[in-house]
């Protein structure tokens, strides 16, 4: 059956032979209605990429550099399956390119000019492409030929395989630049030896190199890693201090109609039958015909790449930046230490309009990027299409797991002028009911619930976390009879109560009328039994404070809070009747942009923050008539974090633990991708 066939692309006679053997052996173990293999032979990996894009083939396995080519338009391929190395219990699908230095040296990443460098080899990922790509814009002009620019940047180097005649400085530390193990400084171990012997000041290798060459921890402690933020970390902290994370070897397919489920079904079956130590007749990860045919011989198996993970996310911002710099050879005109405009990520068109107005008023210091969901915005910040946004704590957690950092906190209670330097304790997550109802925390089963959105703190993580510990399962849509929790599956009972309008029904953005704090409260007013919101929501939308038709006549005393002990209290008493304390919303950014974002925002709030009294004739950053656009409307200021500058420190141990527990029930495709 053609639609059940995976056309594998082979790039040599030997690969084609192995592919035919793969096809025949799979036929013998799979049912006739299961997936099958067909083989397509092309002259090169690039030809395979083009063939897949043109629907003449379906899959091929590629190194990271080629995954980049495959992702570029017009190819638009995506990673679907990753080879893993190491054990099934601790599968490694990536390695980290690192810059290793001796502990007793005192320079940082931005002080490499004039140092001596050790490289694994010319044109190799960890040893050349990544470090030189990331340093590209610091190289002296002209940057072509690249080898000459690098030779003029460092005071001496060992770059195995370089042309020692044309670029003698590149071979200064290893005369002749031998391109094999005859050169003692060749490849990973060689580059590390070049540093160890004192020939070089920095070695560009992969994270495992240090461990493979120094079994003794005391010896490893003599070395450190250079981080991109111009700090240093110990060699075991490579996950937080690397030049780039590099995928090892990846199966790619078309982004649309790419048969990724079928490819996974095929490869999963293949590894069961013909994986490591499975069969004598045919081995997926070796071949009598040659090395690394179709798959790497060192691979131990396959892992499915999460569906939310596109090539940009898979390759990572640093890797793409490095390769793009090398390939395109373009650098910004502004010096790299100058802050470029900050691209704010706006959620759907309501936020985009406010962002546009901010952009006009900021004299171009703010630019705007849009996405339909918070997770899409986070992904855009990760890959450099956007720079920053303000997030509820639940999304600060997801953003943190995806490598972003908190930059400033929204403060709600501290009056100026101390606001900017005050760390607030947070706000209260509360459960609100109508005073006329007889509901308590203990009899919510079967009732109608209203949530700010799935994944948000007060509206989801805190109440559902508490509920989970009571009911011990994730079927929240069965616990409540119906509800509105924007971001739920469209056919779920937790979308039934949402108001839409239609194409935007249950979408986690302002196009859904019941989205956010005000939306969840409106849902309670109009349809629901309980709303999970922040403690300020009821006072902010009653007594005429919200002029919208549905809210203008509401009275605060018509609503009460549910306490965890089964009692109820007035909405004026959240300190004595709440579900938990929630961390304030916070601005997040990529690490490399954090300082610029902070500086710019502190400047912007001085002009457009809560000191502006007349928002009808001036732009106000923290005002959007109860819609919480870009920032919460009750924000007094954005405050410095001081030492709370990681998501764990910012959110606090208790909240991180609660959200981590709820991950059993996670419906976050982005979180799944970021923890792959």
């Amino acid at each position: 059956v053609p639609e059940k066939s995976v056309r594998w692309c082979a790039v040599s006679e030997h690969e084609a032979t192995k592919c035919q053997s793969f096809r025949d052996h799979m036929k013998s173990v799979l049912p006739s209605n299961g997936p099958s293999v067909a083989c397509v032979k092309k002259a090169s990996h690039l030809d395979c990429i083009r063939a897949i894009a043109a629907n003449e083939a379906d899959a091929v396995t590629l190194d990271a550099g080629l995954v980049y080519d495959a992702y570029l338009a017009p190819n638009n391929l995506k990673p679907v399956v990753a080879e893993f190395y190491g054990s099934k219990e601790d599968p490694q699908t990536f390695y980290y390119a690192v810059a290793v230095v001796k502990k007793d040296s005192d320079f940082q990443m931005n002080q490499l000019r004039g140092r001596k460098s050790c490289h694994t080899g010319l044109g190799r990922s960890a040893g050349w492409n990544i470090p030189i790509g990331l340093l590209y814009c610091d190289l002296p002009e002209p940057r072509k030929p690249l080898e000459k620019a690098v030779a003029n940047f460092f005071s001496g180097s060992c770059v195995p395989c370089a042309d020692g005649t044309d670029f003698p400085q590149l071979c200064q530390l290893c005369p002749g630049c031998g391109c094999s193990t005859l050169n003692q400084y060749f490849s990973y171990s060689g580059a590390f030896k070049c540093l160890k012997d004192g020939a070089g000041d920095v070695a560009f290798v992969k994270h495992s190199t240090i461990f493979e060459n120094l079994a003794n921890k005391a010896d490893r402690d003599q070395y450190e890693l250079l981080c991109l933020d111009n700090t240093r970390k110990s060699v075991d902290e490579y996950k937080d201090c690397h030049l780039a994370r590099v995928p090892s070897h990846t199966v790619v397919a078309r982004s649309v109609g790419g048969k990724e489920d079928l490819i996974w079904e095929l490869l999963n079956q293949a590894q069961e039958h013909f994986g490591k130590d499975k069969s004598k007749e045919f081995q997926l990860f070796s071949s009598p015909h040659g090395k690394d045919l179709l798959f790497k011989d060192s691979a131990h198996g396959f892992l499915k790449v999460p569906p939310r993970m596109d090539a940009k996310m898979y390759l990572g911002y640093e890797y793409i930046t490095a390769i793009r710099n090398l390939r395109e050879g373009t650098c910004p005109e502004a010096p790299t230490d100058e802050c470029k405009p900050v691209k704010w990520c706006a959620l759907s068109h309501h936020e985009r309009l406010k962002c546009d107005e901010w952009s006009v008023n900021s004299a171009g210091k703010i630019e705007c990027e849009s996405a339909e969901t918070t997770e899409d915005c986070i992904a855009k910040i990760m890959n450099g299409e956007a720079d920053a946004m303000s997030l509820d704590g639940g999304f600060v957690y997801i953003a943190g797991m995806c490598g972003l950092v908190p930059v400033l906190a929204e403060n709600y209670n501290t009056p100026n002028p101390n606001c900017e330097n005050t760390a607030e304790e947070g706000y209260f997550a509360v459960a609100v009911v109508k005073s006329s109802s007889d509901l308590t925390w203990d009899n919510l089963k079967g009732k109608k619930s209203c949530h700010t959105a799935v994944g948000r703190t007060a509206g989801w993580n805190i109440p559902m976390g508490l509920l989970y510990s009571k009911i011990n399962h994730c079927r929240f849509d069965e616990f409540f009879s119906e509800g509105c929790a924007p971001g739920s599956e469209k056919n779920s009972s937790l979308c039934k109560l949402c108001m839409g309008p239609s194409p935007n029904l249950c979408e986690p953005n302002n196009k859904e009328g019941y989205y956010g704090y005000t939306g969840a409260f409106r849902c309670l007013v109009e349809k629901g039994d309980v709303a999970f919101v922040k403690h300020q929501t009821v006072p902010q939308n009653t007594g005429g404070k919200n002029p919208d038709a549905w809210a203008k006549n509401l009275k605060e005393e018509d609503y009460e809070l549910l306490c965890l002990d089964g009692s109820r209290k007035s909405v004026q008493e959240p300190a004595n009747c709440h579900l938990a304390r929630a961390p304030n919303h916070a601005v997040v950014a990529r690490k490399d942009k954090a300082d610029c974002v902070q500086t710019l925002l502190l400047d912007q709030q001085r002009m457009f923050g809560s000191s502006v009294t007349d928002c009808s004739s001036n732009f106000c950053l923290f005002e959007s008539k109860t819609k919480d656009l870009l920032f919460r409307d009750d924000t007094v200021c954005l405050a410095k974090l001081h030492d709370r500058n990681t998501y764990e420190k910012y959110l606090g141990e208790e909240y991180v633990k609660a959200v981590t527990n709820l991950r059993k029930c996670s419906t976050s495709p982005l979180l799944e991708a970021c923890t792959f």
Partner: nanobody, 117 residues
């Protein structure tokens, strides 16, 4: 709420010019920001140019150097002068003072600009 009405659109050849006007039903002196947006068929509405109360301006990259936004507070009107028009400038052009557009999808009729030979 001030009502805004756009005019001045029309059919023009590539390279030609047009001047769009946005007349307000009341005073625009105290309006913080006014802007022109455009929407081409099947595309999202996008910011073309904006002007603050103090007169500072911002332009979309695609129109920089060709379009100029200005406001005449005495006449309660905002203008968009468009030069060197290109076929990709074809769209319905809308004016906004942002006072209602954040919250409701409140836009005027707009004025059609068609650039074609």
């Amino acid at each position: 709420q001030v009502k805004l009405e756009e005019s001045g659109g029309g059919l023009v050849q590539p390279g030609g010019s047009l001047r769009l006007s946005c007349a307000a039903s009341g005073s625009i002196v105290s309006i913080a920001t006014m802007a022109w947006y455009r929407q081409a068929p099947g595309k999202q509405r996008e910011l073309v140019a904006g002007i603050t109360r103090g007169g500072s301006t911002k332009y979309a990259d695609s129109v920089k150097g060709r379009f100029t936004i200005s406001r005449d507070n005495a006449k309660n009107t905002v203008y968009l002068q468009m030069h060197s028009l290109k076929p990709e400038d074809t769209a319905v052009y809308y004016c906004t003072d942002y006072s209602r557009t954040y919250y409701e999808d409140h836009w005027g009729q707009g004025t059609q600009v068609t650039v074609s030979s």
